[in-house]
Interface confidence: medium
């Protein structure tokens, strides 16, 4: 969590208090679910448990504030990465229709600084070009790249 600013940490402390309905200093899957649903999201119990498992450093099944900071820092890093990928696509999506050609995808990957072999790019294109028309839907590609 060391890449977070003091302001962000203070903001997350406030958010943590909202999550921590019973004020015991930890968040349970139930409390996390309550807040997420109030934010318009509808995660399953399994998804909630997964989120907690990923950052539950001491394995006690709940999240304390330092673990919460880790979760938030990771979430922000993921968001940056996703935005970076979207931006790379926008450069090539001249008409803004959400698709780019498979050939242009190679340039996108180069723009993102990823050193991929031709073999790897071909495999990514095969997975991203769902209907085989040589066009890549970048919404799907962003999801594939960021494992959402």
């Amino acid at each position: 969590a060391d890449q977070l600013t003091e302001e962000q940490i203070a903001e997350f402390k406030e958010a943590f208090s909202l999550f921590d309905k019973d004020g015991d200093g930890t968040i349970t899957t139930k409390e996390l679910g309550t807040v997420m649903r109030s934010l318009g999201q509808n995660p399953t119990e399994a998804e909630l448990q997964d989120m907690i498992n990923e950052v539950d450093a001491d394995g006690n099944g709940t999240i304390d504030f330092p673990e919460f900071l880790t979760m938030m820092a990771r979430k922000m890093k993921d968001t940056d990465s996703e935005e970076e990928i979207r931006e790379a696509f926008r450069v090539f999506d001249k008409d803004g229709n959400g698709y780019i050609s498979a050939a242009e995808l190679r340039h996108v990957m180069t723009n993102l600084g990823e050193k991929l072999t031709d073999e790897e790019v071909d495999e990514m294109i095969r997975e991203a070009d769902i209907d085989g028309d040589g066009q890549v839907n970048y919404e799907e590609f962003v999801q594939m790249m960021t494992a959402k």
């Epitope: 990465s81 990823e114 991929l116 072999t117 073999e119 790897e120 071909d122 495999e123 990514m124 997975e127 594939m144 790249m145 960021t146 494992a147």
Partner: nanobody, 121 residues
């Protein structure tokens, strides 16, 4: 959550071979791109090679190209690192890593605990 467990490390003479295995549990293995990294005490973790989630493509660090081979068996939830023509400079702790993506780029989602490989001259 994915748990990764490496095995197959040990001591070997220079020029010898070793085969490392990494078994994954907890999620659908075929959804994950896999990679091997290694680390010498006091140095940064170094990329060794990676394999796509289907096993259709691989990539290797220049230092191991032609000597190391990565493969996977999605039915057995296992990724392998076949190391041959080993050199003393290959001595390190070897880690496997997983990421929910076609190709493992950037930071892995999950890491194994590592297995020690020692190559003596």
């Amino acid at each position: 959550q994915v748990q990764l467990q490496e095995s197959g490390g040990g001591s070997v003479q220079a020029g010898g071979s070793l085969r490392l295995s990494c078994v994954a549990s907890g999620r659908t293995f075929s959804s994950y791109a896999m990679a091997w990294f290694r680390q010498v005490p006091g140095k940064e973790r170094e990329f060794v090679g990676r394999i796509s989630r289907s096993g259709g493509s691989t990539m290797y660090a220049d230092s191991v190209k032609g000597r190391f081979d990565i493969s996977r068996d999605n039915a057995k939830n296992t990724v392998f690192l076949q190391m041959s023509s080993l050199k003393p400079e290959d001595t390190a702790v070897y880690y496997c890593a997983a990421k929910a993506a076609v190709i493992l780029t950037g930071i892995p989602d999950y890491w194994g605990q590592g297995t020690q490989v020692t190559v003596s001259s």
